[in-house]
């Protein structure tokens, strides 16, 4: 049999070998495609199938506009002028070239030694699905799962049957000061079909700088809290990737799992003291925040407020 590749929406003519070019002809076309469940023999007189597959006067079969459901096998059996039976067999596959792929949400720059999302390559409207590949400085990037990570997603349109492909590239550049060029290409995997390439993006790789300051936020403001209240300490740091955060109380590390938030519920006097957080960045040493003081007091330092509950538990008014 012969393999035929046809573009979706385009006409396709399959010739019936051995068939006389003009009637009278003895021929039979049958097909097994997404429109059939088994073999469908086409009527030489024509009929409802003519909109998808029509026998022409010369015995050829015309598919006016090939679709995904027309993929399959087409066979013609003809008797030539000498009375010999001649068979033609075609395996038809269809394709659709998508629009030019695009890199969406590209990074503005990259930071050395840490994972960076380069961007997401998107291709819309392909059939079959095809593949997306990333290139670095013109060379194919092979994802290794460590320095080069690719996250892929394929979706199929419920009505058209065409595919949308997405590929998200994350890299860990080894050194700063370079200007790598990334591009993405789509390939259908069909012979004689060149890949479609995105416009390249050139990114600057900077060395990871020290975190731009570290702040310790306290809630309630001022760090004064009544017994049984809750204190929330938040270590705010503008570093990427987020560093590990440990906590210190009165100069001693607290035996807690690293976390940028320290929650002190139902505080008592034993929770009073000076707190700070220490951020440890992979490429830099530890950085400590300015300290904050936590004080546990009934109603502050001014003495009982007017209308407060006295020792007797009764409300008193001055």
């Amino acid at each position: 049999g012969q393999n035929i590749t046809a573009r979706i929406g385009e006409p396709l003519v399959l010739s019936c070998k051995g068939a006389p070019k003009k009637p009278p002809q003895q021929l039979e076309w049958k097909l097994n495609t997404g429109r059939t469940e088994a073999w469908k023999v086409l009527s030489p007189q024509g009929g409802p199938w003519d909109s998808v597959a029509r026998i022409l006067p010369n015995g050829s079969l015309l598919l006016p506009a090939t679709g995904i459901v027309d993929e399959g096998t087409f066979r013609c059996r003809a008797t030539n002028r000498r009375g010999k039976e001649v068979k033609s067999n075609y395996r038809v596959r269809v394709y659709q070239i998508p629009g030019k792929p695009e890199i969406v949400d590209p990074a503005s720059e990259l930071t050395a030694s840490v994972p960076n999302k380069v961007g997401t390559c998107v291709s819309e409207g392909s059939y079959p699905a095809g593949t997306l590949s990333w290139h670095l400085d013109g060379k194919l990037l092979i994802p290794d799962g460590k320095e080069t990570l690719v996250k892929e997603e394929t979706r199929r349109h419920p009505e058209t049957g065409l595919f949308t492909l997405r590929s998200e590239l994350t890299v860990i550049p080894t050194q700063g000061g370079t200007h790598p060029t990334f591009s993405c290409s789509f390939s259908l995997g069909l012979p004689r079909r060149r890949p479609l390439n995105t416009a390249p993006i050139q990114l600057r790789v900077r060395e990871p700088g020290p975190p731009e300051g570290i702040q310790l936020l306290v809630e309630p403001e001022g760090g004064i809290v009544a017994p049984g209240g809750t204190v929330t300490l938040t270590c705010a740091i503008s570093a990427q990737p987020p560093p590990q955060v440990h906590w210190i109380k009165d100069g001693a590390p607290l035996p807690l799992a690293p976390s940028p938030v320290l929650l002190l519920p139902e505080v008592g006097h034993e929770d009073e003291g000076t707190y700070s957080c220490v951020a440890t960045h992979p490429s830099h040493g530890p950085q400590e925040s300015p300290p904050v003081s936590i004080r546990v007091t009934e109603t502050g330092d001014e003495g009982p407020a007017e209308g407060s509950v006295g020792e007797s538990g009764l409300g008193t008014l001055a």
Epitope: K40, G46, P48, S51
Partner: antibody, heavy 119, light 107 residues
Framework: EVQLVESGGGLVQPGGSLRLSCAAS????????MTWVRQAPGKGLEWVAS????????YYPDSVKDRFTISRDNAKNSLYLQMNSLRAEDTAVYYC????????????WGQGTLVTVSS | DIQMTQSPSSLSASVGDRVTITCRAS??????VNWFQQKPGKAPRRLIY???NLADGVPSRFSGSRSGTDFTLTISSLQPEDFATYYC?????????FGGGTKVEIK
């Protein structure tokens, strides 16, 4: 909204002629095959003629072949049925329907026009 | 030519009943069968296309099924507005053939 409106029905003598029209709106007319279906009084539905979207190919059952001609004018979004040599058994309500090929059969129908063949 | 033998030709049923109408094709027509509903003095309305697919705007109590050359229209719970005549149509081969119709009447 898809609309099909038939016209041209009436009383005609046996052996006479009549031309039915169907005005289509609400869809891209030249993307669809079109069909005429009839229904004799108190009887079932019978396929009369179909035409492909370009108008190049027409199809008929033996009962009307060589007497009826289906045609279309895509510029006017109109479908026609020229009926010649009419017989008493052609008396029916004639419906215009969208479709007729394997992609969807018939999905929309007009309200019908009555043709009465009687002396 | 293909024959579409529809049965029963008429039936009496009550509101809420489950109703089944069958068409048998004299030869293989694939899934190229439609079902229509027709009320007196009105044009047919498509209910089911390609044997099993519910047409737009048709209530889900209507369903179509197929077993070889046997096609079935089922109304799961008959409603007052469902009393009408139902037709099947094969559109796999010319001449296109309708079933003889099934009139669903109130018991």
């Amino acid at each position: 909204e898809v609309q099909l409106v038939e016209s041209g029905g009436g009383l005609v003598q046996p052996g006479g002629s009549l031309r039915l029209s169907c005005a289509a709106s609400g869809f891209t007319f030249n993307n669809y095959w079109m069909t005429w279906v009839r229904q004799a009084p108190g009887k079932g539905l019978e396929w009369v003629a179909s035409i492909d979207n370009s108008g190049d190919n027409t199809y008929y059952p033996d009962s009307v072949k060589d007497r009826f001609t289906i045609s279309r004018d895509n510029a006017k979004n109109s479908l026609y049925l020229q009926m010649n040599s009419l017989r008493a058994e052609d008396t029916a309500v004639y419906y215009c329907a969208r479709g007729g090929d394997i992609t969807n059969g018939f999905d929309y129908w007009g309200q019908g026009t009555l043709v009465t063949v009687s002396s | 030519d293909i024959q579409m033998t529809q049965s029963p030709s008429s039936l009496s049923a009550s509101v809420g009943d489950r109703v089944t109408i069958t068409c048998r094709a004299s030869q293989d027509v694939g899934f190229y069968v439609n079902w229509f509903q027709q009320k007196p003095g009105k044009a047919p309305r498509r209910l089911i296309y390609r044997a099993t697919n519910l047409a737009d705007g048709v209530p889900s109590r209507f369903s179509g099924s197929r077993s070889g050359t046997d096609f079935t229209l089922t109304i799961s719970s008959l409603q007052p507005e469902d009393f009408a005549t139902y037709y099947c149509l094969e559109f796999d081969e010319h001449p296109l053939t309708f079933g003889g119709g099934t009139k669903v009447e109130i018991k």
